[in-house]
């Protein structure tokens, strides 16, 4: 039961995280106009990975896409790439993890295959989360650098556009969404990897014979089975001694040294 819960929770946390990474990538508020020096502007500027926007006090919002690819700074391109890689890996990880879920039965898929898939998706989630965190952090660093370097007619980190003297940018909501989402995806991936360990039977399984000797309950373990070629080849082996109540997961799993007292 604990394994299923860990796996399920890992999947849900990763799903939320990846949704957050997608949301952050699409959001326009990666950087927002710093209002510290001049809070009374009738125009509020904010910028995303794909376009920059203005919200006028008249109520109108206008956005302009970065229609150039070569004209954009390398750092912005790198952030875009990291976020997209994060989304792609996360999406593939989600797809793999759906089939790996213990609660979902697909044909005669063995638990060993599910364990491998769980581990694969877990690693994908971890890398996805790291990509998102890295992307957001690179952008944040770019903002901090530009904030202090901001002078009249300086080319900023956003598409080589002229930075007017009064417009300095600070962290936007998307950065925080990205950090949290990346963290969640990372945590979800770790949980999937932990769940994988519980799903996978050990290399050596022991047939246990229990008997009572001098008043003590002892588990006698004669020779082990020959190492199997795959995790799922010993499906016919049964435990001779059941040491007590088992959780649902333990009943379905293979014998291990922890099953005996």
């Amino acid at each position: 039961m604990a394994v299923t819960a860990c796996q399920g929770l890992g999947f849900v946390v990763s799903l939320i995280g990846i949704a957050g990474i997608i949301a952050a990538t699409c959001m326009d508020q990666w950087s927002t106009q710093d209002l510290y020096n001049n809070p009374v502007t009738a125009v509020f500027n904010y910028q995303g990975l794909w376009r920059s926007c203005v919200r006028e006090s008249s109520g109108f919002t206008e956005c302009r896409g970065y229609f150039t690819l070569l004209g954009l700074p390398a750092m912005l391109q790198a952030v875009r790439a990291l976020m997209i890689v994060g989304i792609v890996l996360g999406a593939i990880g989600l797809l793999v993890s759906i089939f790996a879920l213990k609660c979902i039965r697909i044909g005669s898929m063995e638990d060993s295959a599910k364990a491998n898939m769980t581990l694969t998706s877990g690693i994908m989630f971890i890398v996805s989360g790291l990509c998102a965190i890295a992307g957001v952090s690179v952008f944040a660093n770019m903002l901090v650098t530009n904030f202090w370097m901001s002078t009249a007619n300086m080319y900023t980190g956003m598409g080589g556009m002229v930075q007017t003297v009064q417009t300095r940018y600070t962290f936007g909501a998307a950065l925080f969404v990205g950090w949290v989402a990346g963290g969640l995806t990372l945590i979800g991936g770790v949980m999937m990897c932990i769940a994988c360990r519980g799903l996978a039977p050990e290399e050596t399984n022991y047939k246990a014979v229990s008997y009572h000797a001098s008043g003590h309950s002892v588990a006698y373990k004669p020779g082990g089975f020959k190492a199997s070629t795959g995790f799922g080849s010993n499906t016919k082996n049964k435990k001779i001694y059941d040491g007590g109540a088992r959780t649902e997961d333990e009943v379905q799993s293979y014998p291990s040294k922890h099953d005996y007292v």
């Epitope: 106009q33 008249s58 109520g59 009249a152 007017t164 003297v165």
Partner: antibody, heavy 117, light 113 residues
Framework: EVQLVESGGGLVQPGGSLRLSCAGS????????MSWVRQAPGKGLEWVSS???????YYLDSVKGRFTISRDNAKNTLYLQMNSLRAEDTAVYYC???????????WGQGTLVTVSS | DIVMTQSPDSLAVSLGERATINCKSS????????????LTWYQQKPGQPPKKLIY???TRESGVPDRFSGSGSGTDFTLTISSLQAEDVAVYYC?????????FGQGTKLEIK
């Protein structure tokens, strides 16, 4: 056709109060940012106050604390409550709608406020 | 506050001739978000409220004759009337719409020579 009609102007003594109204027809004032602009006799234009979405208000420094901009959505009317009036507040007061580029595109005909003893 | 300075204060131009009015802002009005300049030109005839001619420094208001054009960026702007007509006699104002308080130029009185 969009029309903005100001009213409430008149002669008032220094230190007195007036409430200007701007009634809109052919336009729902609550959906737009609105402004008051004044023009002293023979002088240029001077922005006085604006109210934008969410009821956020902005004022010229010289009228801050004395003037209050507000609107009544049910009556489709914009107001400018003017207290502690001074001689330098004498002007024609216009209400105007803010539109693209924060520009004032529709203006009323104005109402004259005279502050004199 | 942003100071808007118009030049000249008054201008006399012959009918059919070009009229040019300048406006200078004490700070850049260019928005980095949409690359637009937040400057508006108004025309005011005696006894009438102002009328918007140009917004975003160069975008002509619908219904405004195409002889009126706006140009400039950052801090320096120009209103040009390519061929002056009798009905163009008025006072012209520039206004910055970027910062509060919104400020106007002192106005330029355009007359026929």
């Amino acid at each position: 056709e969009v029309q903005l009609v100001e009213s409430g102007g008149g002669l008032v003594q220094p230190g007195g109060s007036l409430r200007l109204s701007c009634a809109g027809s052919g336009i729902t004032l609550s959906t737009y940012a609105m402004s008051w602009v004044r023009q002293a006799p023979g002088k240029g234009l001077e922005w006085v106050s604006s109210i934008i979405s969410g009821g956020i208000t902005y004022y010229l420094d010289s009228v801050k604390g004395r003037f209050t901009i507000s609107r009544d959505n049910a009556k489709n009317t914009l107001y400018l409550q003017m207290n502690s009036l001074r001689a330098e507040d004498t002007a024609v007061y216009y209400c105007a709608r803010k539109y693209h580029g924060n520009a004032l595109d529709y203006w009323g005909q104005g109402t004259l406020v005279t502050v004199s003893s | 506050d942003i100071v808007m300075t118009q030049s000249p204060d008054s201008l006399a131009v012959s009918l059919g001739e070009r009229a040019t009015i300048n406006c200078k802002s004490s700070q850049s009005l260019l928005s980095s978000g949409n690359q637009r300049n937040y400057l508006t030109w108004y025309q005011q005839k005696p006894g009438q409220p102002p009328k918007k001619l140009i917004y975003w420094a160069s975008t002509r208001e619908s219904g405004v004759p195409d002889r009126f054009s706006g140009s400039g960026s950052g801090t320096d702007f120009t209103l040009t009337i390519s061929s002056l007509q009798a009905e163009d006699v008025a006072v012209y104002y520039c206004q910055q719409n970027y910062f509060y308080p919104l400020t106007f130029g002192q106005g330029t009185k355009l007359e026929i020579k």
